[in-house]
């Protein structure tokens, strides 16, 4: 291809790609008609004056994953058509003032994964058409007022993975078109009232993995278009009553990994579009009535790994669309007979790793579509007659690691389990804990007459006599609600080059990969 440097490959579509450790300077001559240039994985350490002077038609320039630590202010002179510029994954500590001067068409500027220590208002003052600015993965400790004042068309700003300890309430005030703001993985301890007031078109706000302790009551009151709000892994100990009041478009809210002790009624809402609410790994001790009653479209509610010991009978009022409820790894001893009454569409419930000693006979009475129930590792000695009778879709029931009492009263449950073994899975079966002479024996095959020879076994009405079998040959544990496969916590739908590193285990919330989104 005419005019293509030997260390590069050039395509007929005016795309040039130069890669390799042997490259130590911008290759020349570059094709005059190049529209896309990528310089990747080279040993280039600096960009001198005007290395791209003869390729003024360039639209996209990617200089990534190099050793680049120094750029001359005029390096990008004559690139008036450039729309996309990436300097990501280099070793830049300083940006010269005026570096982006003349880049009048620039829409995307990626400066992520460098070592930038500061930015100044003058850096971006010429970039009036910029729509996307990526600054994540640098060493920024402070954003000065005015830094983004000229970027009135900006729709996406990523400041994640820096060292920001505070944010000025004025720094985003002119970004009325911003749709995505990411501030995750910084060291923010609080966010001043008014910080987000100018962001009337904001759709996503990522504040996870900071050290935020308090949220101002009106912090999000101007963000009526917010759809995704990530507040997980902070130090939030309480939520002001009105903090989420003005978020009618919100469909995703993550609050896991905080220090919340209580959820005050009405805190969530009205949020008619919220589909998922992640509250695991907090210190919640009780759930009052109506705490979620504004979340009419909620489908996933994760409350695992808290300290919940009391759930008011009306706690889940309003959750008529809920599909997944995770309550595992809490301190539940009792459940009121009406507590799940409203959950008509519930499919999966995880109650494992609690201290439940008994279940009300009608606990699942209105929850006819249940497909999976996790009850392992509780203090259950028996279950009420007919508790699962109406659950025709139940295909996964985990009952192991409970102290089952194998006396004559266990017979109805034993009979039902015998006829419904496919539901129990093959990993671990429930075993008797008492009497001592049958301890450790499978509850399903135990001879109750042997277990309590001195007790006459009465004719007890059995659990349903018709065995139930799944439609498909097997339900592998990899797709089960109790799967312990390592999976991410809520996917934080990022489409840029960043990936959020998550180490959360699937067992955090006891659900399937498909359910995690």
């Amino acid at each position: 291809y005419h005019g293509c440097p030997s260390e590069c490959t050039c395509s007929r579509a005016s795309q040039v790609e130069c890669t390799g450790a042997r490259i130590v300077a911008v290759p020349t001559p570059l094709p005059w008609n190049a529209m896309s240039l990528q310089i990747l994985n080279t040993h280039i350490t600096e960009l001198n004056e005007s290395p791209f002077l003869n390729i003024s038609a360039l639209i996209a320039l990617r200089i990534e994953k190099n050793e680049l630590s120094r750029i001359t202010p005029g390096a990008f002179r004559n690139l008036g058509s450039l729309r996309y510029l990436s300097l990501a994954n280099n070793k830049l500590q300083v940006l010269p003032i005026g570096l982006f001067q003349g880049l009048d068409s620039l829409e995307s500027l990626l400066l992520s994964s460098n070592q930038l220590l500061q930015i100044q208002p003058a850096h971006f003052s010429q970039c009036s058409n910029l729509k996307e600015l990526q600054l994540h993965g640098n060493h920024l400790e402070y954003i000065p007022d005015g830094a983004f004042d000229h970027l009135v068309g900006l729709t996406k700003l990523n400041l994640g993975k820096n060292s920001l300890t505070h944010i000025s309430p004025r720094v985003f005030q002119h970004l009325g078109n911003l749709q995505v703001l990411r501030l995750y993985e910084n060291r923010l301890t609080d966010i001043p009232m008014g910080t987000f007031d100018g962001l009337v078109n904001l759709q996503e706000l990522a504040l996870q993995q900071n050290q935020i302790g308090l949220l101002s009551p009106g912090l999000f009151h101007n963000n009526h278009n917010l759809q995704r709000l990530y507040l997980s892994n902070n130090h939030i100990s309480q939520l002001p009553p009105s903090v989420f009041m003005q978020l009618p478009q919100l469909n995703r809210l993550t609050l896991f990994g905080n220090s919340l002790k209580e959820l005050s009624p009405g805190i969530f809402g009205p949020m008619p579009n919220l589909r998922e609410l992640w509250l695991y790994d907090n210190h919640i001790s009780s759930l009052p009535d109506n705490v979620f009653s504004n979340l009419r479209q909620l489908q996933v509610l994760i409350l695992s790994r808290n300290q919940i010991s009391f759930i008011s009978p009306g706690a889940f009022n309003g959750l008529t669309e809920l599909r997944e409820l995770s309550l595992h790894t809490n301190a539940l001893q009792d459940l009121d007979g009406n507590v799940f009454r409203m959950l008509a569409n519930l499919q999966n419930i995880s109650l494992q790793n609690n201290r439940l000693r008994q279940l009300p006979g009608n606990i699942f009475a209105n929850v006819n579509g249940l497909m999976a129930i996790q009850l392992q590792n509780n203090q259950l000695e028996n279950l009420p007659l007919g508790i699962f009778d109406h659950l025709g879709k139940l295909c996964e029931l985990r009952l192991y690691d409970n102290p089952w009492r194998c006396d004559s009263d266990i017979l109805p449950l034993r009979n039902w389990l015998l006829l419904n073994q496919p539901r129990l899975g093959t990993d671990t079966v429930p075993v008797c804990f008492s009497p001592a002479n049958v301890r450790g024996q499978s509850l399903i095959i135990i001879n109750v007459n042997v277990a309590v020879p001195s007790v006459h076994v009465p004719e007890v009405p059995s659990y349903p006599e018709t065995p139930w079998y799944p439609d498909t040959p097997s339900y592998p544990d990899t797709t089960s609600v109790s799967s312990t496969t390592e999976l991410t916590s809520p996917v934080e739908d990022y489409t840029d080059l960043t990936t959020i590193q998550v180490t959360d285990d699937r067992s955090v919330w006891g659900m399937t990969q498909a359910q995690s989104g």
Partner: antibody, heavy 118, light 107 residues
């Protein structure tokens, strides 16, 4: 239908204890929390605590902690509220009450008058 | 503890009158407020729960409203059997607390 029937009136001396019973019928006794609420003569209502009959777990209002004990007998579907170290200000009608679909009191016993007088 | 301040403590009204009783919580209780009617020598009777939902069998002249800290019970047209004492109760957090009561008397 749900019914809560309480024991009869009691007269006690200061310092004594009283044990009031509440017999439940019309539903599965072990499956629903039962509360105790009292009302001094001419006064308002005061929540004392709850018991979960299935397990015997209790929660008491701080004001009564150490003086009140709530127990149950599942064989007779009866809950008991015992108040010790009685003083004249404990003179009141004591009600047992069951929650409905929320933590409000849908079903009430008829009340038991406890008079503390020397 | 959450205080429930009910007003007025008593009122005189005639049959057919519209009666309004208010209850103010000392902190946010969402919609977790119930209203009860009590007649002398009887146990209280649930009228309204979740601030605005009428209990089964309660006449439509009784209505409730409010959320957060301010709540109202309204009797749209007072009937002879409505002369009684009315209590509000919060069940948002322990200990559950009641208002001091409002006695509705015949004028």
């Amino acid at each position: 239908q749900v019914q809560l029937v309480q024991s009869g009136a009691e007269v006690k001396k200061p310092g004594a204890s009283v044990k009031v019973s509440c017999k439940a019928s019309g539903y599965t006794f072990t499956d629903y929390y039962i509360n105790w609420v009292r009302q001094a003569p001419g006064q308002g209502l005061e929540w004392m605590g709850w018991i979960y009959p299935g397990s015997g777990n209790t929660k008491y209002a701080q004001k009564f902690q150490g003086r009140v004990t709530m127990t149950r007998d599942t064989s007779t579907s009866t809950v008991y509220m015992e108040l010790s170290s009685l003083r004249s200000e404990d003179t009141a009608v004591y009600y047992c009450a069951r929650w409905g679909y929320g933590a409000y009191f849908t079903y009430w016993g008829q009340g038991t008058l406890v008079t503390v007088s020397s | 503890d959450i205080q429930m301040t009910q007003s007025p403590s008593s009122l005189s009204a005639s049959v057919g009158d519209r009666v309004t009783i208010t209850c103010k919580a000392s902190q946010n209780v969402g919609i977790n407020v119930a209203w009860y009617q009590q007649k002398p020598g009887k146990a209280p009777k649930l009228l309204i729960y979740s601030a605005s939902y009428r209990s089964s069998g309660v006449p439509s002249r009784f209505s409730g409203s409010g959320s957060g800290t301010d709540f109202t019970l309204t009797i749209s047209s007072l009937q002879p059997e409505d002369f009684a004492t009315y209590y509000c109760q919060q069940y948002s957090s322990f200990p559950y607390t009641f208002g001091g009561g409002t006695k509705v008397e015949i004028k």
